[in-house]
C-alpha cells in the first residue's frame, strides 16, 4: 500500500543564517522532502471469485497501485510464478495477451488492471482452495506479486472479504538502489529536521499530522481501476494445492469479490533488513524475489520464520522476461 | 546471447512422425513461451500453437491440434514439436519463436518423400 | 478466426522512395481496457526467419531503424518505409497478436524496380 508521511512545512530561515549551514538547512532538505513525500511503495491487489452458475470456473482480478509503467503481467496458480505455480496466462500492455489452459479469457481491464476467467473440467480445473498469484513487472519499482484464494467457506458466486497482506515479491535489483537512498534521505531528513527544533532559526511549524505516522489508504477495486499505470503483462498461477494463504481475515469491502491488497509497508534496503521487518497478519507471508542473488547466482539466505527470499529465475535481462517479452 | 538452435532438415517417409527440436540458450528458459510457425515454400506464414514451460497445456491452432503435439523439457531447455501422420502438405520450413516473437530460430526443412 | 488481408501483394519501388503497405483485419484489434492495438509487422528476407519490426501496431522494436512506422488503429492499419532502402527488400507480414489463433497476414512483397 502506498504510505504518505505528513512532513511539516518548513520556514524559510531568519535573516543572518548563511554560509555552508544555510545551504544545507535550505536545498538538502526540501531535495529529500519531495523525495520523502512522493515516494510510494507499490501495491498489488488480487480479487477472486468462483462463479454460481459454473463451481469450477473461476474469475481473477489484479490490479497494480504504483506510479511505475508496467510492463508484464504474469497469473498463475498454485504458488508464486516461478517457485512451482502454474503459469495461466501473460499480459504485455503493447505486445498482446497469451493465455494457457484452463484459463479461457485474459484481458486488460484497465491501462493497471487485468481479468482473467477460468473454467476446467478435469484435472487441469481450478478448485476452491487454489491460490491464484498476479506478477507485475514494472518500472522502476521491480516486480511485485501478490496471491490470494477463496476461503473454504465461501458459498459459490460470493467472494472472501479483503485479506491482510498476501505474498509480497519484490525484485531488489531494480529498486534496492532507490529504496536505500530514500530511507535514509528520510531518516537524514527526520535527523535534520530534530535538529531545527532544538536551534532558535529556522522555527518548524507543527504539522496537523505526525511526521512519522504514514497514512494508509484503503484501495477498493473501483478505485484501483481509476489508476492510470502502465500494465504491461500478467501472470495466473493456479492449482489445487493446499491454498498458501489465510483469507479467513475480513476486513470489510466488497461482498462480490475476495480482495487481496499486498501491503508494502516497508523499503528494505538490502536482504538483511528483512530480517527484523515485522512478519505480516497470520496466514500470510512476504517474500523477496532477488535479481541480484540471481545474479550472483546464489541462493540469498533464510531470514527468519515467515521470511523467504526466492532469487529471480529470470536472470539480467528479467525485465523483458514474460514481463516484455513479445 | 539468445538463440533458438533447431535442426537444419530432416526427411522423412509419408506416414511416419517426426520430432522437431528447438533448443534454447542465452536467457532463462521457464520464463518463455515457444511459438511454432509453419511456412510452405513461397507461402505464407502459418501459427501451429505454442507452449509455455510452466504450463503443460499448448495452445493450438484448430488445423493443425491432430497434427502437432507440444512439449517441453525444462531440464534442457528444449522444446519439441512433433508431427503425425505425414503426408506431402506437411513439406515446408518449421520455426519456433521465443515470447512475443524477438527471437526465431533459422528453421526446420522438413521434406515428406517416399 | 480473425483474418488478416495485406494489399498490395507486391510492390515495385525505387531506392530512397516512401512505401506504403495495408493490413485488414476481419475484426477490431483494439483491446477496449486498455485502447491498445494488438498488430505486429514481420519482415522476411529470403532463406531467412521473419524479424519483428513492429509491435502494439506503432512501436518500434528495439534495433529496428526509425524509416519504419508503423500505425493505425481497430481493423485499417499500415507500414511506411520512409525512404527505401536496397537491404529492405523483403516481404512483409502483419499478424494479429489480439486473440487465439494469431494469424498472419497474406503478406507484401517490396521488389525493386
Known amino acids: 500500500m502506498r504510505t504518505e508521511a505528513q512532513v511539516p512545512a518548513l520556514q524559510p530561515p531568519e535573516p543572518g543564517l548563511e554560509g555552508a549551514m544555510g545551504h544545507r538547512t535550505l536545498v538538502l532538505p526540501w531535495v529529500l522532502l519531495t523525495l520523502c513525500v512522493t515516494a510510494g511503495t507499490p501495491e498489488v491487489w488480487v480479487q477472486v471469485r468462483m462463479e454460481a452458475t459454473e463451481l469450477s470456473s473461476f474469475t481473477i482480478r489484479c490490479g497494480f497501485l504504483g506510479s511505475g509503467s508496467i510492463s508484464l503481467v504474469t497469473v498463475s496458480w498454485g504458488g508464486p510464478n516461478g517457485a512451482g505455480g502454474t503459469t495461466l496466462a501473460v499480459l504485455h500492455p503493447e505486445r498482446g495477451i497469451r493465455q494457457w489452459a484452463p484459463a479461457r479469457q485474459a484481458r486488460w481491464e484497465t491501462q493497471s488492471s487485468i481479468s482473467l476467467i477460468l473454467e476446467g473440467s478435469g484435472a487441469s480445473s481450478p478448485c476452491a482452495n487454489t491460490t491464484f498469484c498476479c506478477k507485475f513487472a514494472s518500472f522502476p519499482e521491480g516486480s511485485w506479486e501478490a496471491c490470494g484464494s477463496l476461503p473454504p467457506s465461501s458459498d459459490p458466486g460470493l467472494s472472501a472479504p479483503p485479506t491482510p497482506a498476501p505474498i509480497l515479491r519484490a525484485d531488489l535489483a531494480g529498486i534496492l538502489g532507490v529504496s536505500g537512498v530514500l530511507l535514509f534521505g528520510c531518516v537524514y531528513l527526520l535527523h535534520l529536521l530534530r535538529r531545527h527544533k532544538h536551534r532558535p532559526a529556522p522555527r518548524l511549524q507543527p504539522s496537523r499530522t505526525s511526521p512519522q505516522a504514514p497514512r494508509a489508504r484503503a484501495w477498493a477495486p473501483s478505485q484501483a481501476s481509476q489508476a492510470a499505470l502502465h500494465v504491461p503483462y500478467a501472470t495466473i498461477n493456479t492449482s489445487c494445492r493446499p491454498a498458501t494463504l489465510d483469507t479467513a481475515h475480513p476486513h470489510g469491502g466488497p461482498s462480490w469479490w475476495a480482495s487481496l491488497p499486498t501491503h508494502a509497508a516497508h523499503r528494505p534496503q538490502g536482504p538483511a533488513a528483512w530480517a527484523s521487518t515485522p512478519i505480516p497478519a497470520r496466514g500470510s507471508f512476504v517474500s523477496v524475489e532477488n535479481g541480484l542473488y540471481a545474479q550472483a547466482g546464489e541462493r540469498p539466505p533464510h531470514t527468519g520464520p515467515g521470511l523467504t527470499l526466492f532469487p529471480d529465475p529470470r536472470g539480467p535481462r528479467a525485465m523483458e522476461g514474460p514481463l516484455g517479452v513479445r | 546471447q539468445v538463440q533458438l538452435q533447431q535442426p537444419g532438415a530432416e526427411l522423412v517417409k509419408p506416414g511416419a512422425s517426426v520430432n522437431m527440436s528447438c533448443k534454447a540458450s542465452g536467457y532463462t528458459f521457464s520464463s518463455y513461451w515457444i511459438t511454432w510457425v509453419k511456412q510452405r515454400p513461397g507461402q505464407g506464414l502459418e501459427w501451429i500453437g505454442d507452449i509455455h514451460p510452466g504450463n503443460t497445456s499448448p495452445n493450438y491452432n484448430e488445423k493443425f491440434r491432430t497434427k502437432a503435439t507440444l512439449t517441453v523439457d525444462t531440464s534442457s531447455s528444449t522444446a519439441y514439436m512433433q508431427l503425425s501422420s505425414l503426408t506431402s502438405e506437411d513439406s515446408a520450413v518449421y520455426y519456433c519463436?521465443?515470447?512475443?516473437?524477438?527471437?526465431w530460430g533459422q528453421g526446420t526443412t522438413l521434406t515428406v518423400s517416399s | 478466426d480473425i483474418v488478416m488481408t495485406q494489399s498490395p501483394s507486391s510492390l515495385s519501388v525505387a531506392a530512397g522512395e516512401k512505401v506504403t503497405m495495408s493490413c485488414k483485419s476481419s475484426?477490431?484489434?483494439?483491446?477496449?481496457?486498455?485502447?491498445?492495438?494488438?498488430l505486429a509487422w514481420y519482415q522476411q528476407k529470403p532463406g531467412q526467419p521473419p524479424k519483428l519490426l513492429i509491435y502494439g501496431a506503432s512501436t518500434r522494436e528495439s534495433g529496428v531503424p526509425d524509416r519504419f512506422t508503423g500505425s493505425g488503429s481497430g481493423t485499417d492499419f499500415t507500414l511506411t518505409i520512409s525512404s527505401v532502402q536496397a537491404e529492405d527488400l523483403a516481404v512483409y507480414y502483419c499478424?494479429?497478436?489480439?486473440?487465439?489463433?494469431?494469424?498472419f497476414g497474406t503478406g507484401t512483397k517490396l521488389e525493386l524496380k
Open positions: 499478424q494479429n497478436d489480439h486473440g487465439y489463433p494469431l494469424t
Open positions: 519463436a521465443r515470447g512475443w516473437g524477438d527471437y
Open positions: 475484426q477490431s484489434l483494439l483491446n477496449s481496457g486498455n485502447q491498445k492495438n494488438y
